[in-house]
């Protein structure tokens, strides 16, 4: 049974607006038509699900309406964007990819992307 390798960048810095983007790329052992991508956040050994989307190859990723994630897919690459991040959200963001259909099922977990978020400095008070 072949393994499925998932690659993601080691470090990403969020923008001053609290937006972080990274690519999650998987080496598909087969020709999957249905793929599920999950982003998990690990901080202090606690793991929580940030967002998840299931998509059909060739179609757009659809996250829930209230999700902080958006994304697009191109072949075996998923471009993920996480919004609304604050300094307290700094942590390791793990990309998990599942090839749901057709069988056989495959699961791959990336090494994680350390996302650093720095809250912007407040604007100095204006004299005017």
């Amino acid at each position: 049974c072949k393994a499925m390798h998932v690659a993601q960048p080691a470090v990403v810095l969020a923008s001053s607006r609290g937006i972080a983007s990274f690519v999650c790329e998987y080496a598909s052992p087969g020709k999957a038509t249905e793929v599920r991508v999950t982003v998990l956040r690990q901080a202090d050994s606690q793991v929580t699900e940030v967002c998840a989307a299931t998509y059909m190859m060739g179609n757009e990723l659809t996250f829930l309406d209230d999700s902080i994630c958006t994304g697009t897919s191109s072949g075996n690459q998923v471009n993920l964007t996480i919004q609304g991040l604050r300094a307290m959200d700094t942590g390791l963001y793990i990309c998990k990819v599942e090839l749901m259909y057709p069988p056989p099922y495959y699961l791959g977990i990336g090494n994680g992307t350390q996302i650093y978020v720095i809250d912007p400095e407040p604007c100095p008070d204006s004299d005017f």
Epitope: A3, H5, L40, Q42, E49, G108, I109, N111
Partner: nanobody, 115 residues
Framework: EVQLVESGGGLVEPGGSLRLSCAAS????????MGWYRQAPGQQRDLVAH???????MYADSAKGRFTISRDNAKKTVYLQMNSLKPEDTAVYYC?????????WGQETQVTVSS
């Protein structure tokens, strides 16, 4: 180096139960997924169930209702409780561990359901 040690396989009559165990040794990431696959003669190796360290569980359709997966994070051990076994559950069962950036297979354990 990560190693997986399985136990609990054997011969059981139809309708009986077995509990498989798989213990991981070595250093593994705090987020990980442990699970079971099985391979019947002449068939491909198929997922039975898996469970993540944060408790998320997935079952294959063939395992729903009769099989229960659980784990002890402190012992780095996963269990597969198999009830109401049928002859078609006869297969070689494999433990699998997914960690950040890697995965590992255990040694096989044979499960035979026959009267």
């Amino acid at each position: 180096e990560v190693q997986l040690v399985e136990s609990g396989g054997g011969l059981v009559e139809p309708g009986g139960s077995l509990r498989l165990s798989c213990a991981a040794s070595g250093s593994i990431s705090s987020y990980n997924v442990m699970g079971w696959y099985r391979q019947a003669p002449g068939q491909q190796r198929d997922l039975v169930a898996h469970i993540a360290s944060n408790g998320e569980i997935m079952y294959a359709d063939s395992a729903k209702g009769r099989f229960t997966i659980s784990r002890d994070n402190a012992k780095k051990t996963v269990y597969l409780q198999m009830n109401s076994l049928k002859p078609e559950d006869t297969a070689v069962y494999y433990c699998k561990l997914w960690v950040l950036g890697n995965d590992y297979w255990g040694q096989e354990t044979q499960v035979t359901v026959s009267s």
